[in-house]
Amino acid sequence: MMTGTIETTGNISAEKGGSIILQCHLSSTTAQVTQVNWEQQDQLLAICNADLGWHISPSFKDRVAPGPGLGLTLQSLTVNDTGEYFCIYHTYPDGTYTGRIFLEVLESSVAEHGARFQIP
């Protein structure tokens, strides 16, 4: 039975040209995390495998950095980065858990600074 829950940063905003940390946390389960996939809509951004380390999609390697932890740092943000991001946790023995984050990249300098994991 899957008892775990994914906590995410929820809806976050950042300024164009800036950086943001996407972070998820799996709680309420003793399941072992074997791999975390980061996806933007249906496009793979990165994989963090417990045994093999990180795979950053070549299309994003110049502006995606692994970490902190199982999170992902997006750099040089553009308005086109606005949208849904998903963290997909592969666990043993529970199976797969998915978390959702909505990122809004703002043109102006009035981006909210309330996001818990946001880089100032």
Epitope: T34, Q35, P58
Partner: antibody, heavy 119, light 107 residues
Framework: EVQLVQSGAEVKKPGASVKVSCKAS????????MHWVRQAPGQRLEWMGR????????KYNEKFKSRVTITVDKLSSTAYMELSSLRSEDTAVYYC????????????WGQGTTVTVSS | DIQMTQSPSSLSASVGDRVTITCRVS??????LAWYQQKPGKSPKLLVY???TLAEGVPSRFSGSGSGTDFTLTISSLQPEDFATYYC?????????FGPGTKVDIK
């Protein structure tokens, strides 16, 4: 066109080391991880390890961890695999292979380098 | 280590035949499975990754299916250039491991 061109065949004595090179072209070398895989005569393929050419960070198969070192030279877009303390069982064809877009599989392979270990 | 088995180990078939190769894995690897084709004296060539996604330039007669621990590579209509050895590989953990191969030869 993606190309991985490996160094030539090697004959080594037991206990020696061998260093195989793999020159990449046709793509941005630092954007794609590189794997090394070997195949002994008549045997299945055996994964040895992988490296991120950008950071130089590597991961190894525990079986080879004490004997294998994978490195890169970013300037020449070349990956290297060095295997030490050679024994006859290391006689195999050694391949470099570029990691794919969407995970830890390999989408392009070098032509292979035959390493023969014999006294 | 994740163990990979393939069946059959070899098969004889004719041009135009439908060929199915199976790969069984010792633990759940979700859909993280690749298939490669290798001809004698040549390097492996990627056919399928993520269990069912066809690699660039691979003919549509090849298809992959399965998830979890059981996977299949199907060649819908065997062509002369398809006579080769086929390997499955999981791409999910360290070490990455390959199946023993299935040799497809001419009947």
């Amino acid at each position: 066109e993606v190309q991985l061109v490996q160094s030539g065949a090697e004959v080594k004595k037991p206990g020696a080391s061998v260093k195989v090179s793999c020159k990449a072209s046709g793509y941005t070398f630092t954007n794609y991880y590189m794997h090394w895989v070997r195949q002994a005569p008549g045997q299945r393929l055996e994964w040895m390890g992988r490296i991120d050419p950008d950071s130089g960070g590597s991961k190894y198969n525990e079986k080879f961890k004490s004997r294998v070192t994978i490195t890169v030279d970013k300037l020449s877009s070349t990956a290297y695999m060095e295997l030490s303390s050679l024994r006859s069982e290391d006689t195999a064809v050694y391949y470099c292979a570029r990691e794919g877009h969407y995970g830890f599989y390999s989408d392009y392979w070098g032509q292979g380098t035959t390493v023969t270990v014999s006294s | 280590d994740i163990q990979m088995t393939q069946s059959p180990s070899s098969l004889s078939a004719s041009v135009g035949d439908r060929v199915t190769i199976t790969c069984r894995v010792s633990e759940n690897i979700y859909s993280y499975l690749a298939w490669y084709q290798q001809k004698p004296g040549k390097s492996p060539k990627l056919l399928v990754y993520n269990a069912k996604t066809l690699a660039e330039g691979v003919p549509s007669r090849f298809s992959g299916s399965g998830s979890g621990t059981d996977f299949t590579l199907t060649i819908s209509s065997l062509q002369p250039e398809d006579f080769a050895t086929y390997y499955c590989q999981h791409h999910y953990g360290n070490p990455l491991t390959f199946g023993p191969g299935t040799k497809v030869d001419i009947k």
